[in-house]
Amino acid sequence: KSSNEATNITPKHNMKAFLDELKAENIKKFLYNFTQIPHLAGTEQNFQLAKQIQSQWKEFGLDSVELAHYDVLLSYPNKTHPNYISIINEDGNEIFNTSLFEPPPPGYENVSDIVPPFSAFSPQGMPEGDLVYVNYARTEDFFKLERDMKINCSGKIVIARYGKVFRGNKVKNAQLAGAKGVILYSDPADYFAPGVKSYPDGWNLPGGGVQRGNILNLNGAGDPLTPGYPANEYAYRRGIAEAVGLPSIPVHPIGYYDAQKLLEKMGGSAPPDSSWRGSLKVPYNVGPGFTGNFSTQKVKMHIHSTNEVTRIYNVIGTLRGAVEPDRYVILGGHRDSWVFGGIDPQSGAAVVHEIVRSFGTLKKEGWRPRRTILFASWDAEEFGLLGSTEWAEENSRLLQERGVAYINADSSIEGNYTLRVDCTPLMYSLVHNLTKELKSPDEGFEGKSLYESWTKKSPSPEFSGMPRISKLGSGNDFEVFFQRLGIASGRARYTKNWETNKFSGYPLYHSVYETYELVEKFYDPMFKYHLTVAQVRGGMVFELANSIVLPFDCRDYAVVLRKYADKIYSISMKHPQEMKTYSVSFDSLFSAVKNFTEIASKFSERLQDFDKSNPIVLRMMNDQLMFLERAFIDPLGLPDRPFYRHVIYAPSSHNKYAGESFPGIYDALFDIESKVDPSKAWGEVKRQIYVAAFTVQAAAETLSEVA
């Protein structure tokens, strides 16, 4: 049955009414309003914006809108003692210094409180030494350096280009390699698309532009001082030495003008292959140290940032459900930005604002959703997903019993080519069905569905005629809901053409140039892509909150479980002798997946046939669907990552942004040929297969007939 069967519904109060109420012009207006000044987490400006959003959501008609505050560890540069990097000669004189700030964009010259580029949570320090260029500082880059090139980073300052993986993983890898400092820079190969001008004349990164960002390795912990528990008024805080995920070496980001000055002098080994070369006119020598004439010169970092416990504010709005008020569908995105937040996050926050306004309009006309909808404007996402994680920690008992779904709403755009969706397999069919009903905004697809343009531009690698939907990784506010609590989650945004644009993210990401004008002039002048994203996110929330039977298809989980089991088995089979020697078998996992497939199929048949007018049976079936994602949670968590508890998905240990399937087995197998104690290593593989097989079987049994 369709959504229009929800309570107090008149024919016009259906999904169409909700979608028709969404207006591109409003999103544009909200984006402008949210981007005129910086809204850095922990600042007065961001508190004022929280209060503004609270007030407007109340006006829009939500039942209640509250601020939820927490006192968490944040990081700021020292205003009187700026961070910079220098080249020093043999006498210790600074012969070159990197810039202290980005040149402000036109029209913003007089804006105060623009935080200069910095790596949040870097410790203080002034290390000096020889430079080693480490490419993207990925695990495989350090393998290449250490194992193949025999280059030792111990006691060196490393310089790494941004891109490919989360910056925190780069720093962790550098620390493990023994580096004493890290310089991060944006290479034009990754942040300057050919044929496009630099901002303000285009959407490319100018040479003075710099990407800010945190460099934590929290692994889902939230506030570094209160892992597992909310940072409330009576919190017990760890000492800074015991804080979770803080880097131990100084780190600082620079733009490509400054990077040129450091890299042009590099000597030592040549780059191992072309994949280590960017687009600057430098040799990309690996080092260590500078070439002949400059060999006595060193690099020195000057980092004076401080970590401070600071108050942050989430805005939580409630639209009470008429039939199942104790079932929560959550739409959340962050509000804090590094500077103006033209894309990240305000292109998402503006969409959430318009979705709230549309729901509020329907509510004012007498409609209510079947289930409760919670709207969230999260704080301190940029400092490690802190606002969302602290709120989820505070409300974990309610969420694990009542959470139906979480839809994330950070940046609505990272390009204007096609849709990008990452979600739980439970939502595949919801996304497919919804996008078939929405109009494509794309040129050349007038009168065609969004599903059609999306499928054409981003086809599934496995199933012809279907679009690509990716695994959830992390690096955004869905993390605690999905990876820790096991609440079905999804995210959608408009993206670039990954095949033709090889740069990482979008060029102006986390720079001062991420302005309203960037969006309005270059990405989405008509705000049609924003509107489409609003329709996708809002439509998903509408269906999840309003459909009589939850729009989850457990059979899609069965399909991916088989795919993931095949994949991890094939990785293990790269070690056929060890599989025999240590009696490693995947039979239990494949058996569990087979059982899951059969039980899911039977459940789906029952779902078609049961009496939906019986509220007890309806609730029972919906609860089985709601709790299926929860069933994949292992209360003990993954090895050394207790807050990543989902057995099927976790953020990659090598790139927080990417999702990994069967992460416990994957990590146990990773680089296993380099484990000195193979008996122990293969024992851990066997244990992880056991955990995965048990979890899949246990999840399957939650779908069995209850008696």
Epitope: K574, H575, Q577, K580, T581, V676, D677, P678
Partner: antibody
Framework: EVQLVESGGGLVQSGGSLRLSCEAS????????MTWIRQGPGKGLEWVAN????????YYVDSVKGRFTISRDNARNSLYLQMTSLKAEDTAVYYC??????????WGQGTLVTVSS | DIQMTQSPSSLSASVGDSVTITCRAS??????LNWYQQKPGKAPKLLIY???SLLSGVPSRFSGSGSGTDFTLTISGLHPEDFATYFC??????????FGQGTRLDIK
């Protein structure tokens, strides 16, 4: 069971040649660095040579460079040490080993090479 | 090349005693230090890697410690089968792989 079995040792005249073999079982040979280590009578352990999993790189102790050649045949799970221009000081028990991060975690039983002058 | 120096070169002890063998590197090797045990006529066996990690199956009476240049192998409560020669080896800067000269542990 994971094991390495050396063969090919024996008595040889100074200036002569010998080829040692090492057969691996119980592990996926082509994934691992391999090494030869020797131990002179009543002496300590001395690294001789090692070779990359794909055979494209090898390294030698200075005293054997130009005389010894380490090689491997991954299809046969076998490691070799071709020794030429042998000297009395090359007399030793030669062990083949599996190396992980330059730690030798599996050793063969050894094969004795005696060079008579 | 990094030189490894073991001390003592030999020592005598009784069953039940605790003994400590030290190994010094000529330069810092972080924790890239491994210990092997060799019995007469047999191949060496790995006991401890990266200074303090005990290989599976090695009794817990063996322990390693140290970092930088100074390392120790301790056997707490000698068993009869522990009388053997012990070698340290650095795996920090390679090639070459270098070993200590060995410490022979005899029954008193």
């Amino acid at each position: 069971e994971v094991q390495l079995v050396e063969s090919g040792g024996g008595l040889v005249q100074s200036g002569g040649s010998l080829r040692l073999s090492c057969e691996a079982s119980g592990f996926t040979f082509s994934n691992y660095w391999m090494t030869w280590i020797r131990q002179g009578p009543g002496k300590g352990l001395e690294w001789v040579a090692n070779i990359k999993p794909d055979g494209t790189e090898n390294y030698y102790v200075d005293s054997v460079k130009g005389r010894f050649t380490i090689s491997r045949d991954n299809a046969r799970n076998s490691l070799y040490l071709q020794m030429t221009s042998l000297k009395a000081e090359d007399t030793a028990v030669y062990y083949c080993g599996r190396m992980i991060q330059f730690v030798i975690n599996i050793w063969g039983q050894g094969t004795l090479v005696t060079v008579s002058s | 090349d990094i030189q490894m120096t073991q001390s003592p070169s030999s020592l005598s002890a009784s069953v039940g005693d605790s003994v400590t063998i030290t190994c010094r590197a000529s330069q810092s090797i972080n924790n890239y230090l491994n210990w092997y045990q060799q019995k007469p006529g047999k191949a060496p066996k790995l006991l401890i890697y990266t200074a303090s990690s005990l290989l599976s199956g090695v009794p817990s009476r063996f322990s390693g410690s140290g970092s930088g240049t100074d390392f120790t192998l301790t056997i707490s409560g000698l068993h009869p089968e522990d009388f053997a020669t012990y070698f340290c080896q650095q795996s920090f800067s390679t090639p070459p792989i270098t070993f200590g000269q060995g410490t022979r542990l005899d029954i008193k």
